[in-house]
């Protein structure tokens, strides 16, 4: 039974490689998937000596290890690329690294949008 799942319809979108891949650089992504399959949002990034380099954000296809995650939290210790996924619209707006070995929790907030 899939109790209490947060339905994901839209995610924050970002692609650092947008020029080469001929996509938008950032925005919102409407998630599309097969009927009866769950959808998630994800974020991926690099951490070079404390400098966060966002790689990609967007929709993520049905992945069991993303089920029931309300927040985007990466737990791998020191990967080349950090990854997190979550359920719920725009849940990938902010993302966190919480290493399993009990290091400091680091949360990355999106920069505030410039006033129009």
């Amino acid at each position: 039974s899939g109790r209490g799942e947060a339905e994901t319809r839209e995610c924050i979108y970002y692609n650092a490689n947008w020029e080469l891949e001929r996509t938008n650089q950032s925005g919102l992504e409407r998630c599309e998937g097969e009927q009866d399959k769950r959808l998630h949002c994800y974020a991926s990034w690099r951490n070079s000596s404390g400098t966060i380099e966002l790689v990609k954000k967007g929709c993520w296809l049905d992945d069991f290890n993303c089920y029931d995650r309300q927040e985007c939290v990466a737990t791998e210790e020191n990967p080349q690329v950090y990854f997190c996924c979550c359920e719920g619209n725009f849940c990938n707006e902010r993302f966190t690294h919480l290493p399993e070995a009990g290091g400091p929790e680091v949360t990355y907030e999106p920069p505030p949008t410039a006033p129009t």
Epitope: S1, G2, R3, G4, E5, E34, D36, K37, R38, L61, D62, D63, F64, N65, C66, Y67, D68, R69, V73, T75, F83, C85, E100
Partner: antibody, heavy 118, light 111 residues
């Protein structure tokens, strides 16, 4: 080092019950989904059940629905499989497995044997 | 009911190349099923070889590779060795919390 240690297997009569446990160590148990997979003697692997990180979503193969219940205690780093109304065809080695992103089984326990026989 | 099919048995000469496949009765296997492959020797727990179609698990030699061939997932072993003689299982994640294992392929390394 990731370790998964199953226990609770044994001989049980048809219609009986057993509760399997899987003690996890070497990783933060609450951060990963988990699953049970079984293997009947001389047969192939068969997925049995899966449970999400919080325990809020549980899933079963058709042949065990209504008889088996998967659960987890994140404070005890333990996965459970409650097996009721056991049948001879449930005889198998039961493995617990850790599920990682892209829905694969990245670590396996050594298994515990369940024998259902009169 | 989804059935995942594998060749029941396969033989390969030492140093040879073998490709095991994994299909299913409901259409084509694609990367969205996150195909993964496991090796099992008698009396042992399975060992994870390949996940997410083509990513090798930690410590798996690069003689093992995964791909999509036509409408099936595939596991290729190049330069087969005697200790590759095992059972090999593919798994497809069908989504909605459901996995289906293939029936397994018994690989014999001749000689």
């Amino acid at each position: 080092e990731v370790q998964l240690l199953e226990s609770g297997g044994g001989l049980v009569q048809p219609g009986g019950s057993l509760r399997l446990s899987c003690a996890a160590s070497g990783f933060t148990f609450r951060n990963d989904a988990m699953s049970w997979v079984r293997q009947a003697p001389g047969k192939g692997l068969e997925w049995v059940s899966g449970i999400s990180v919080t325990g809020g979503s549980t899933f079963y193969t058709d042949s065990v629905k209504g008889r088996f219940t998967v659960s987890r205690d994140n404070s005890r780093n333990t996965l459970y499989l409650q097996m009721n109304s056991l049948r001879a065809e449930d005889t198998a080695v039961y493995y617990c497995a850790k599920v990682y992103y892209t829905s694969f089984f990245d670590y396996w326990g050594q298994g515990t044997l369940v024998t259902v026989s009169s | 009911q989804t059935v995942v099919t594998q060749e029941p048995s396969f033989s390969v000469s030492p140093g040879g190349t073998v490709t095991l496949t994994c299909g299913f009765n409901s259409g084509s296997v694609s990367t969205s099923y996150y195909p993964s492959w496991y090796q099992q020797t008698p009396g042992q727990a399975p060992r994870t070889l390949i996940y997410n179609t083509n990513t090798r698990s930690s410590g798996v030699p690069d003689r093992f590779s995964g791909s999509i061939l036509g409408n099936k997932a595939a596991l290729t072993i190049t330069g087969a060795q005697a200790d590759d003689e095992s059972d090999y299982y593919c798994v497809l994640y069908m989504g909605s919390g459901i996995w289906v294992f293939g029936g397994g392929t018994k690989l014999t390394v001749l000689g």
